[in-house]
């Protein structure tokens, strides 16, 4: 059986939309599947790599690598999207290309970044972990760390940094899929909203879905002990 909830929820474009949340009901009137997984049920994607989930994550990453920051022209906010999802008339798509990106490092101004921009994250404005010396962030936004400390400046002069961010990574469903969504949408979909991150590649949704002890390597499920737990 399925339980369907419909509600008006604030979506990425800043408008309220009618959204359906479909929950598989437990035949035995017990905990939901996500709760059972958290309690240690034998859920194979938490025990070993699942090819289907791995393909999904790789597909999400490939899309994210090509994303940019969609900044609303009316200053209502910004969100990380694909170019096709960013209105050409109502918004500005900030994407580094044709030598418009910042330098990889101040020691080599000539080598420009091509991957980015990312809403609310920039190697030029992040103090911790700083992109410098032996720790220069790669020219691939899907390999960027979470910035834990921004430079103390209320305005950077960068469109993708000075805007109000409207969406962050949200882990939805038992398949560990990730979407950049508003907090409202994420909570309605019973997802896990990552306030600290800017990109889906910075969060490990399956680790969150599985719960219990975190994976030793967040990309490799290793909860073999589930075989004895349930």
């Amino acid at each position: 059986a399925q339980h369907v909830t419909t509600q008006l929820v604030l979506r990425n474009k800043g408008v309220y939309e009618s959204v359906k949340y479909i929950q598989q009901e437990n035949f035995w009137i017990g905990p939901s599947s996500i709760d059972l997984i958290h309690l240690g049920a034998k859920f194979s994607p938490c025990i070993r790599k699942d090819q289907q989930i791995e393909q999904l994550v790789l597909r999400e990453r490939d899309l994210e690598r090509d994303s940019g920051c969609c900044v609303q022209n009316d200053h209502s906010g910004c969100i990380q999207t694909q170019r096709k999802d960013c209105s050409e008339t109502l918004a500005t798509f900030v994407k580094w290309q044709d030598d418009t990106g910042p330098p990889m490092d101040k020691s080599d101004l000539g080598q420009k970044r091509t991957s980015g921009a990312v809403c609310h994250q920039d190697p030029r404005t992040c103090e911790e972990p700083a992109s410098s010396g032996a720790h220069i962030w790669p020219d691939d936004i899907t390999k960027w760390p979470i910035c834990t400390e921004q430079a103390k400046s209320n305005r950077t002069g960068f469109l993708h940094m000075d805007c109000q961010i409207k969406g962050r990574p949200c882990c939805i469903s038992t398949k560990g899929s990730c979407e950049i969504t508003t907090r409202e949408y994420c909570e309605f979909m019973h997802g896990y909203f990552h306030e600290e991150a800017t990109l889906c590649s910075q969060v490990h949704c399956l680790d969150k879905v599985c719960g219990l002890l975190p994976f030793l390597n967040p990309e490799v499920p290793d909860q073999f002990y589930r075989l004895w737990l349930s």
Epitope: G101, K106, T125, K152
Partner: antibody
């Protein structure tokens, strides 16, 4: 507000070492992404970038003059120093210090300049 | 080194005129170009960053455009305080270099 002010000897002789000081206020050179550097302008001519020093003590010099230039800073006193060794009459110019940022590598604040004449 | 060529060397205008100043780079520099104004006996002042981005406190009559090798600084309706020298600067690579300047003078 941000201010920078240069000071120098005014006049010196060829082969001497020119020592310049930039005193600034309104920001700290320990602040991430900020630097202070030197630019000169011979009378009635264009601007020539000389050197920059960054918050993390990284230094960058104009390769054409690198062998003669030394830039340093005293973060606690808000001072940046530039030494030009073995000066020549071609070094006669107005010397400016300016703040730079890694945000765009442009100079957003400039001092008023100090005039330096090299003459025998 | 990247060479910046500015044209014209001198531009004679009357207040109220609209003018365009040009800067050409010896190689493609993306949008890594900034414009400065220097009034007589004063220090330079940043007008435009990244070819077209405005600087806070700079009058809206100043605007920039261009990318790659060709850049333009436009002044819409020149005012008396706009007379002086205008320099472009590239930050595409070290060493940072400036153009020789365009002198905007009263006709």
């Amino acid at each position: 507000q941000v201010t920078l002010k240069e000071s120098g000897p005014g006049i010196l002789q060829p082969s001497q070492t020119l020592s310049l000081t930039c005193s600034f206020s309104g920001f700290s050179l320990s602040t991430f992404a900020l630097g202070v550097g030197w630019i000169r302008q011979p009378s009635g001519r264009g601007l020539e970038w000389l050197a920059h020093i960054w918050w993390d003590d990284d230094k960058y010099y104009n390769p054409a003059l690198k062998s003669r230039l030394t830039i340093s800073k005293d973060t606690s006193k808000n001072h940046v120093f530039l030494k030009i060794a073995n000066v020549d009459t071609a070094d006669t110019a107005t010397y400016y210090c300016a703040r730079i940022t890694t945000y765009y590598y442009g100079m957003d604040y400039w001092g008023q300049g100090t005039s330096v004449t090299v003459s025998s | 080194d990247i060479v910046l060529s500015q044209s014209p060397a001198t531009l004679s205008v009357t207040p109220g005129d609209s003018v365009s100043l040009f800067c050409r780079a010896s190689q493609s520099i993306g949008n890594h170009l900034h414009w400065y104004q220097q009034e007589s006996h004063a220090s330079p002042r940043l007008l435009i960053k990244y070819a077209s981005q405005s600087i806070s406190g700079i009058p809206s009559r100043f605007s920039g455009s261009g990318s790659g090798t060709d850049f333009t600084l436009s002044i819409n309706s020149v005012e008396t305080e706009d007379f002086g020298m205008y320099f472009c600067q590239q930050s595409y690579n070290w060493p940072l270099t400036f153009g020789a300047g365009t002198k905007l003078e009263l006709k």
